[in-house]
């Protein structure tokens, strides 16, 4: 029977930066029970708070409600594990609100082919912003990705289409079934999920761009 | 404990390239970004560009942007940074440093640094 | 790009003595300005982030005050294992740029 190994903060995500969640990963537990409590300060404070929510976000986490969460403020947590031989404290982990931010998957995403009389067709796309996020304050840049592929493919193409929320593709097989989907980040945080995927069926007088 | 182990010294001619690599151990390596900056020798610091190991994404500084590339291997925990089209004045020590939590771009832990020389 | 301009480039002084590194950025950041020592042959150590926020386990000696376009790093008392050169850095904007360093020098 031994005091627990060091606990790892290992992840943070906020779906919004108007709540956050952080999960810690527990170190052995040194044959005992053991117990879990994060504590944390915002920078320039010396009080420390405990965790407001254990509940919310599942086994080993922290959940930051709206009144617990400021933006634009460093916040430095660590886990303390105790059990009855002794305890021991994760690092310390910084965390920026601003900087963890996980959106939803874009919205609304339609896929048409145009087929111009003075141009090559080309597949034209388009969608909305998650609703969550409020990008008329200018605290957030979403840039958006897109893939595809032919139903049958294993392989993804995948296309960057930085902060547009429209694209075109023109180099597509025609006659092929495609499933489009788009996903997007804030520029300093994570990739949302993809967004459900979208079917269209390219004509078979799609004609290929050279 | 938190540590960062670099590639050894490199000789290179002008020219060539350079892949200099960063071993991550004693965190989970896609909780942070990690940074390139190299100092030429008696100089000061210059930042590269940073990388988020968890998705690839990368930032660089526009100066390197067509010669430099950062990479990473999940599998192993390691960073890379990749210098093309080596010239004299390559010749620096390239350090990989860790983002200091989950927010802006200070350093909390740097490798040990490489020593690059680029010379004829 | 936002340069840091450092003063002085090196500054001569004695165990116990209070120095003062000023750190002045091209245009507006914030508090978002570090500040490392370096030693010779060693990479750069953390100090200060967030312009006055010490990071863990750093001496209480070494502060910072500023914000905006000028920032200064105050060693209140010098002790031996301080000899070294200051480095400030800037993460308000991209690319995240450098003070040209302070030595700071035993007199």
């Known amino acids: 029977q031994l005091p627990p190994g060091k606990p790892e903060i290992f992840k943070c995500r906020s779906p919004n930066k108007e709540t956050f969640t952080c999960w810690w990963r527990p170190g052995t537990d040194g044959g005992l029970p053991t117990n879990y409590s994060l504590t944390y300060h915002r920078e320039g404070e010396t009080l420390m708070h405990e965790c407001p929510d254990y509940i919310t976000g599942g086994p080993n986490s922290c959940h930051f409600g709206k009144q617990y969460t400021s933006m634009w403020r460093t916040y430095v947590m660590m886990v303390n594990a105790t059990n009855q031989m002794g305890s021991s404290f994760s690092d310390e982990l910084y965390v920026d609100v601003t900087y963890i931010v996980q959106p939803d998957p874009p919205l609304e995403l339609t896929v048409e082919v145009k087929q111009p009389e003075d141009r090559k067709p080309y597949l034209w796309m388009k969608w909305s912003p998650p609703t969550l996020i409020d990008l008329k304050t200018g605290w957030f840049t979403l840039l958006y990705e897109i893939r595809l592929k032919p139903e049958k493919a294993a392989e993804w193409e995948t296309h960057f289409a930085g902060q547009q929320t429209e694209f075109k593709i023109l180099s597509l097989h025609p006659g092929q079934k495609y499933l489009v989907q788009v996903r997007c980040k804030p520029d300093h945080g994570y990739w949302s999920a993809w967004s459900p995927a979208t079917f269209i069926q390219i004509p078979s007088d799609f004609i290929m761009n050279d | 404990e938190v540590q960062l182990v670099q590639s050894g010294a490199e000789v290179k001619k002008p020219g060539s390239s350079v892949k200099v690599s960063c071993k991550a151990s004693?965190?989970?390596?896609?909780?942070?970004?990690m940074h390139w900056v190299r100092q030429a020798p008696g100089q000061g610091l210059e930042w590269i560009g940073e990388?988020?190991?968890?998705?690839?994404?990368?930032n660089y500084n526009q100066k390197f942007k067509d010669r430099a590339t950062l990479t990473v291997d999940k599998s192993t925990s390691t960073a890379y940074m990749e210098l093309s089209s080596l010239r004299s004045e390559d010749t620096a020590v390239y350090y990989c440093?860790?983002?200091?939590?989950?927010?802006?771009?200070?350093?909390?832990?740097w490798g040990q640094g490489t020593l690059v020389t680029v010379s004829s | 790009d936002i340069q840091m301009t450092q003063s002085p480039s090196s500054v001569s002084a004695s165990v116990g003595d209070r120095v003062t590194i000023t750190c002045k950025a091209s245009?507006?950041?914030?508090?978002?300005v570090a500040w490392y020592q370096q030693k010779p042959g060693k990479s750069p150590k953390l100090l200060i982030y967030?312009?006055?926020n010490r990071y863990t386990g750093v001496p209480s000696r070494f502060s910072d005050s500023g914000s905006g376009t000028d920032f200064t790093l105050t060693i209140s008392s010098l002790q031996p294992e301080d000899f070294a050169t200051y480095f400030c850095?800037?993460?308000?904007?991209?690319?995240?740029?450098f003070g040209g360093g302070t030595k700071v020098e035993i007199k």
């Open positions: 440093a860790r983002n200091g939590g989950l927010g802006p771009a200070w350093f909390s832990y």
């Open positions: 004693g965190y989970t390596f896609t909780t942070y970004w």
């Open positions: 990388i988020d190991p968890s998705d690839s994404y990368s």
């Open positions: 245009q507006y950041v914030g508090t978002a």
């Open positions: 967030s312009a006055s």
């Open positions: 850095q800037q993460y308000s904007s991209y690319p995240w740029t």
